[in-house]
């Protein structure tokens, strides 16, 4: 049985793999940050967990996706203010009964040390400092991702 | 009620450095985007650029090689530098906050009431 | 960089009528990020629309914003006094940001 926040998940997920396949980006657009291979987008504004995925998929988007606990510390290196939390990709899946990543992956559990409890309607968010659960009905902000597409160098045969 | 105000001479010699200062007062130079942006006498608007809180900048290419533009978290403040001013950059310069495309406040939300800048020897 | 035309240069309108402005794209403008502002005589730009269509804070609702794509509309449906102005569109979803030439909304 899939709770309302893992059916809101997945039905995103599916409608952005039936999109047509788009170009490289190679540059991040305007207002997105840079961080290495990424465009991150921060909000200044605040929405429940399900509302910021549906945002940052209007955005052509998805929630951030954390990698390893580098990725984080770089994350958390934007956030300037300690009281401000943003919501990233990540929340718990009821049926099985672990972290989930938006994109079906689960949470490897040396990546992240989250404070809270890991239970129903439980969603990840990120401080300058720290990673906590919270419900995810609970209105904070949001942190979208694209993703860039490495440039790789031609190699030309001697002339 | 966040507030800009602009500060900076009001007569600049041509080849010298434009510099303008906008204080934000009543909120936080966090998450938003802040914009400079001029209007010559009678005419339309220009967009010079804006600087992130992070300090990472976005500059109008006709303006790029001329345009700094920095910002000082601690202080609430943002400024532009425009060096080689000639008589063409005679104009209002207005301070202003741009909520991106994120949430109620996308686009430029908040202006400064703007200062007059003559290029003039 | 993206080039906004508005059309007309001038309108010529008494209170109580409907004012329709254009606004014209060289190209598409990404998920229809487009404002309006109103600017009087010696004040700072007001934004007025963004999204193409939002209201911004404040702003009454007789201010409308329509279109997508290269063709946008601000319609005011009802001119009050007030409402004599300068209008400019501008557009956010590429850099540089860009602003069309205005349209001045005058007394007939």
């Known amino acids: 049985q899939k709770s309302s926040i893992e059916k809101c998940s997945v039905d995103i997920q599916q409608s952005r793999n039936k999109t047509t396949e788009r170009p490289g980006l190679l540059n991040c657009p305007i207002y997105w940050q840079q961080l290495r291979e990424k465009c991150l987008l921060f909000s200044h504004t605040v929405n429940p967990w399900n509302n910021s995925l549906a945002d940052c998929s209007t955005k052509e988007s998805s929630l951030l996706l954390i990698r390893d606990k580098d990725e984080l510390i770089h994350t958390q290196n934007l956030i300037r203010d300690k009281a401000i939390l943003f919501w990233i990709g990540l929340n718990f899946s009821l049926s099985e009964k672990n972290w989930k990543w938006i994109n079906g992956s689960f949470l490897n559990s040396n990546d992240l040390e989250i404070r809270g409890d890991a239970k129903e309607n439980s969603c990840i968010s990120i401080s300058q400092t720290s990673v906590y659960s919270e419900y995810c009905s609970t209105e904070i902000r949001w942190i979208c991702q694209k993703e860039l597409t490495p440039v790789r160098n031609k190699v030309y045969p001697d002339s | 009620q966040v507030q800009l105000q602009e500060s900076g001479p009001g007569l600049v010699k041509p080849s010298e450095t434009l510099s303008l200062t906008c204080t934000v007062s009543?909120?936080?130079?966090?998450?938003?985007?802040w914009s400079w942006i001029r209007q010559p006498p009678g005419k339309g608007l220009e967009w010079i650029g804006y600087i992130y809180h992070s300090g990472s900048t976005n500059y109008n290419p006709s303006l790029k090689s001329r345009v700094t533009i920095s910002v000082d978290t601690s202080k609430n403040q943002f400024s532009l530098k425009l060096s080689s001013v000639t008589a063409a950059d005679t104009a209002v310069y207005y301070c202003a906050r741009d909520g991106g495309i994120v949430g109620v406040t996308e686009a430029i939300d908040i202006w400064g009431q703007g200062t007059v800048v003559t290029v003039s020897s | 960089e993206v080039v906004l035309t508005q059309t007309p240069g001038t309108l010529s309108l008494s209170p109580g009528e409907r004012a329709t402005l254009s606004c014209r794209a060289s190209q598409v403008i990404s998920s229809s990020y487009l404002a309006w502002y109103q600017q009087k005589p010696g004040q700072a730009p007001r934004l007025l629309i963004f999204?193409?269509?939002s209201r911004a804070t404040g702003i009454p609702d007789r201010f409308s914003g329509s279109g997508s794509g290269t063709d946008f509309t601000l319609t005011i449906s009802r001119l009050e006094p007030a409402d004599f102005a300068v209008y400019y569109c501008?557009?956010?979803?590429?850099?540089?940001?860009?602003f069309g030439g205005g349209t001045k909304v005058e007394i007939k």
């Open positions: 999204g193409a269509s």
């Open positions: 501008q557009q956010y979803g590429s850099s540089p940001l860009t």
């Open positions: 009543g909120g936080s130079i966090s998450f938003y985007y």
